[in-house]
């Protein structure tokens, strides 16, 4: 059977006026997954995103990540979109510098 990913979005200062937002998916099976940043619901172009490899996490499941740089103050326009085994979810950028809670999706 399939194991849905836990999705976690974090933010960090990149440079003056910019922040890097990172979306991590972990503990999912099988390994096929779509993870992408969207602006106003539209996927960002590939050249503005950085992806990590889909790697085993040691529990028979997998993990991966995608990151992009955005302008501070525009966070509300951006979401991380995840699709896995026929299910999907959308994840906002957290406010401030705090980590976003993990969300398990079924």
């Amino acid at each position: 059977g399939s194991v849905p990913p836990m999705v976690n979005v974090t933010r960090s200062e990149a440079s003056e006026g910019n922040i890097t937002v990172t979306c991590r998916a972990s503990s999912f099976y099988p390994r096929n997954i779509t993870l992408t940043w969207r602006q106003d619901g539209v996927s960002l172009s590939h050249d503005t995103q950085q992806w990590g490899d889909v790697l085993p996490d040691g529990n028979g499941t997998y993990q991966t990540w995608v990151a992009t740089r955005i302008c501070q103050g525009e966070e509300q326009r951006f979401t991380c979109y995840m699709e896995h085994s026929g299910n999907h979810s959308t994840h906002p950028v957290p406010s401030g510098n705090s980590h976003h809670h993990h969300h398990h999706h079924h």
Epitope: R38, D40, G41, V42, S43, Y81, E83, H88, S89, T90
Partner: antibody, heavy 118, light 108 residues
Framework: EIQLVQSGAEVKKPGSSVKVSCKPS????????IYWVRQAPGQGLEWIGY????????IYNQQFKDRATLTVDKSTSTAYMELSSLRSEDTAVYYC???????????WGQGTLVTVSS | EIVLTQSPATLSLSPGERATLSCSAS???????LHWYQQKPGQSPRLLIY???NLASGVPARFSGSGSGTDYTLTISSLEPEDFAVYYC?????????FGQGTKVEIK
């Protein structure tokens, strides 16, 4: 086949409100944003706002922020746009549209004509 | 707000002729955020070209798009009778999302 079906034409009095519905089909309702756009007779296209049906986030064009209300009913996979304090210049065709993978508006509803007249 | 100015407002041409439509932005925008739509009388707009130069599904190859920065162009290499319509450019780079005022391509 992806379709967005909107409610029928409305005639409203100045000062009243109108609520237009949009029911998409052919894809997972919560996977794409729903945008609203209007077009006055013989005029161009004007973006009102959008809603992310999955998380409920709404982004408005500031010009409509005080009068437009966007909502979704996930149980019926339907999106709504309500416009209050109607005036004659709100007479227009109101469209819903779906955000696309690579563009803001990839599929459109058939439009709903709202006529504001005393 | 980014203002998109389309020119000309009306283009009168005959079938078989080449149509060149311009869209000028008040501020520079990434080519990833410039799209074109076609609208025929009594119909909803239809996505024609996305991200400056990519044809939407089902759009004939006689349509093409180009441009960068503040200047973008939609070209119809040889007009067919069904191409006579209004064309809108639209930017998604900054809020509010905006459209040009449209160029009407009419039969001469």
């Amino acid at each position: 086949e992806i379709q967005l079906v909107q409610s029928g034409a409305e005639v409203k009095k100045p000062g009243s409100s109108v609520k237009v519905s949009c029911k998409p089909s052919g894809y997972a309702f919560t996977s794409n944003n729903i945008y609203w756009v209007r077009q006055a007779p013989g005029q161009g296209l004007e973006w009102i706002g959008y809603i992310d049906p999955y998380i409920g986030r709404i982004i408005y064009n500031q010009q409509f922020k005080d009068r437009a209300t966007l909502t979704v009913d996930k149980s019926t996979s339907t999106a709504y746009m309500e416009l209050s304090s109607l005036r004659s210049e709100d007479t227009a065709v109101y469209y819903c549209s779906r955000s696309g993978e690579r563009s803001n508006f990839d599929y459109w509803g058939q439009g709903t004509l709202v006529t504001v007249s005393s | 707000e980014i203002v998109l100015t389309q020119s000309p407002a009306t283009l009168s041409l005959s079938p078989g002729e080449r149509a060149t439509l311009s869209c000028s932005a008040s501020s520079s925008i990434s080519s990833n955020y410039l799209h074109w739509y076609q609208q025929k009388p009594g119909q909803s707009p239809r996505l024609l070209i996305y991200r400056t130069s990519n044809l939407a599904s089902g759009v004939p190859a006689r349509f093409s798009g180009s441009g960068s920065g503040t200047d973008y162009t939609l070209t119809i290499s040889s007009l067919e009778p069904e191409d006579f319509a209004v064309y809108y450019c639209q930017q998604g780079g900054s809020l509010p999302l905006t459209f040009g005022q449209g160029t009407k391509v009419e039969i001469k």
